[in-house]
Interface confidence: medium
C-alpha cells in the first residue's frame, strides 16, 4: 500500500501528523502552491495544542497558515469545517481592513508574533508551514 | 538501484494522442512526485507537468494544462504521460523523471528514464 | 511565471581551463536551483542540487555556488568527458523552468 510511518527528512513529526516550517517567504498563494508540491497542505490548526505546536516552532514571526475567505467565507484548504473549528484569532480580527492602501481588504490569515491570527493581505511575502498527514508522508529520506 | 524505464517510439498523425509509460523499480514508487520533461530536435528542456502516485495530486505547466494528462498506477509502479490533439511541433524526446527532496523543499530531479521518442508526421 | 537566463549559450575551452556558466532568475529563488549535464541522444544528469550541493558520484572539479537571483556552476579544471549541454532549473513552485542551456565544446 502507500501508507507511510515517518516523516520525511526535515519535517517534524507531532500527532500523527508532519510539519515543515519555511525559512523564507512567500505570497500566500505561492507558499499554498509550494506545500501543494510537497504533496501537502498549509497547516490547518484544529486544537489549542496543534497551535502551541506551531508557535513553538515558529517563533515571533509573521507565517501564514492554510486558512482564507479569498471566496467569501473562510474556509480551511483541506476542508475542515471553519465554523465549527478551533479558532484563536487576535482581538478584533479578523477585520478584513483596506487601509494599508495595497488594493483590497485582507483574505489570508497568519500567525502573528504572539501566536494569535490575524488577516492579511495575501501578497505579503510571509513565513509559511506545510503539513501532510503522517500516513500519506515519505518513510524514507531522498536517494541520490 | 532506482530505474526509470520508458516505453518505446512512437510516431502519431496530427490530431492523434499519445500515451507513453515510465516503469519505476528500485524505490518505493509512491514516496517520490514524477515529472515529465520534453526536449525537440536541437532545442532545451521543457517541464511538462508533475504528478504524485501517493495521492495522485497533479500540477501542469500552463502550455500543457488540458492537452497533458499524467496518472499513475501504484500496482504496477508505472506513471503514464498521454499527450492529445498532437501537432507537429510535439516531435520530442520525453522524459520522465523523479523528483528528489533534500533539506526541506529543495528539490531536483535525481532520475531520469530513457528519453521516449515521439514523432509527430502526417 | 519565473525567467532564467542562463550564459553563455554556448562555450568552447581547452583541457585544463577554468569554466563558470551563470544563471540569472527574475525573482528571489533562495537556493533552489539545480544543475545538470546532458550529452547528446541522452538524458540529462543531476550534478548540483539545492544551488550548491554535489549529487553523488560528480567529481569534485564541479561546484555550484549562489543563491537568491545569480547563480553559478564552476568546473575548476575541464576534462575532455565534460563536453556537453549544460541547464540550471528552479523549483522555487511551478513551473520547474529551464535554463535555455549551455553547449560546452573541448577545443
Known amino acids: 500500500g502507500s501508507e507511510r510511518t515517518c516523516c520525511p527528512v526535515n519535517w517534524v513529526e507531532h500527532e500523527r501528523s508532519c510539519y515543515w516550517f519555511s525559512r523564507s517567504g512567500k505570497a500566500w498563494a505561492d507558499a499554498d502552491n509550494y506545500c501543494r508540491l510537497e504533496d501537502a497542505h498549509l497547516v490547518v490548526v484544529t486544537s489549542w495544542e496543534e497551535q502551541k505546536f506551531v508557535q513553538h516552532h515558529i517563533g515571533p514571526v509573521n507565517t501564514w497558515m492554510g486558512l482564507h475567505d479569498q471566496n467569501g467565507p473562510w474556509k480551511w484548504v483541506d476542508g475542515t469545517d471553519y465554523e465549527t473549528g478551533f479558532k484563536n484569532w487576535r482581538p478584533e480580527q479578523p477585520d478584513d481592513w483596506y487601509g494599508h492602501g495595497l488594493g483590497g481588504g485582507e483574505d489570508c490569515a497568519h500567525f502573528t508574533d504572539d501566536g494569535r491570527w490575524n488577516d492579511d493581505v495575501c501578497q505579503r511575502p510571509y513565513r509559511w508551514v506545510c503539513e501532510t498527514e503522517l500516513d500519506k508522508a515519505s518513510q524514507e529520506p531522498p536517494l541520490l | 538501484e532506482v530505474q526509470l524505464v520508458q516505453s518505446g517510439a512512437e510516431v502519431k498523425k496530427p490530431g492523434s494522442s499519445v500515451k507513453v509509460s515510465c516503469k519505476a523499480s528500485?524505490?518505493?514508487?509512491?514516496?517520490?512526485?514524477i515529472n515529465w520533461v520534453r526536449q525537440a530536435p536541437g532545442q532545451g528542456l521543457e517541464w511538462i507537468g508533475e504528478?504524485?502516485?501517493?495521492?495522485?495530486?497533479?500540477f501542469y505547466a500552463q502550455k500543457f494544462q488540458g492537452r497533458a494528462t499524467l496518472t499513475a498506477d501504484k500496482s504496477t509502479s508505472t506513471a503514464y504521460m498521454e499527450l492529445s490533439s498532437l501537432r507537429s511541433e510535439d516531435t520530442a524526446v520525453y522524459y520522465c523523471?523523479?523528483?528528489?527532496?533534500?533539506?526541506?523543499?529543495?528539490?531536483?530531479?535525481?532520475?531520469w528514464g530513457q528519453g521516449t521518442t515521439l514523432t509527430v508526421s502526417s | 511565471d519565473i525567467q532564467m537566463t542562463q550564459s553563455p549559450s554556448s562555450l568552447s575551452a581547452s583541457v585544463g581551463d577554468r569554466v563558470t556558466i551563470t544563471c540569472r532568475i527574475s525573482e528571489n529563488i533562495y537556493s533552489n536551483l539545480a544543475w545538470y549535464q546532458q550529452k547528446p541522444g541522452k538524458a540529462p544528469k543531476l550534478l548540483v542540487y539545492?544551488?550548491?550541493n554535489l549529487a553523488d558520484g560528480v567529481p569534485s572539479r564541479f561546484s555550484g555556488s549562489g543563491s537568491g537571483t545569480d547563480f553559478t556552476l564552476t568546473i575548476s579544471s575541464l576534462q575532455p568527458e565534460d563536453f556537453g549541454t549544460y541547464y540550471c532549473q528552479h523549483f522555487w513552485g511551478t513551473p520547474f523552468t529551464f535554463g535555455q542551456g549551455t553547449k560546452l565544446e573541448i577545443k
Open positions: 539545492a544551488a550548491i
Open positions: 504528478i504524485f502516485p501517493r495521492s495522485d495530486n497533479t
Open positions: 528500485g524505490y518505493t514508487f509512491t514516496n517520490y512526485g
Open positions: 523523471a523523479r523528483k528528489g527532496r533534500d533539506y526541506g523543499t529543495s528539490h531536483y530531479f535525481d532520475y
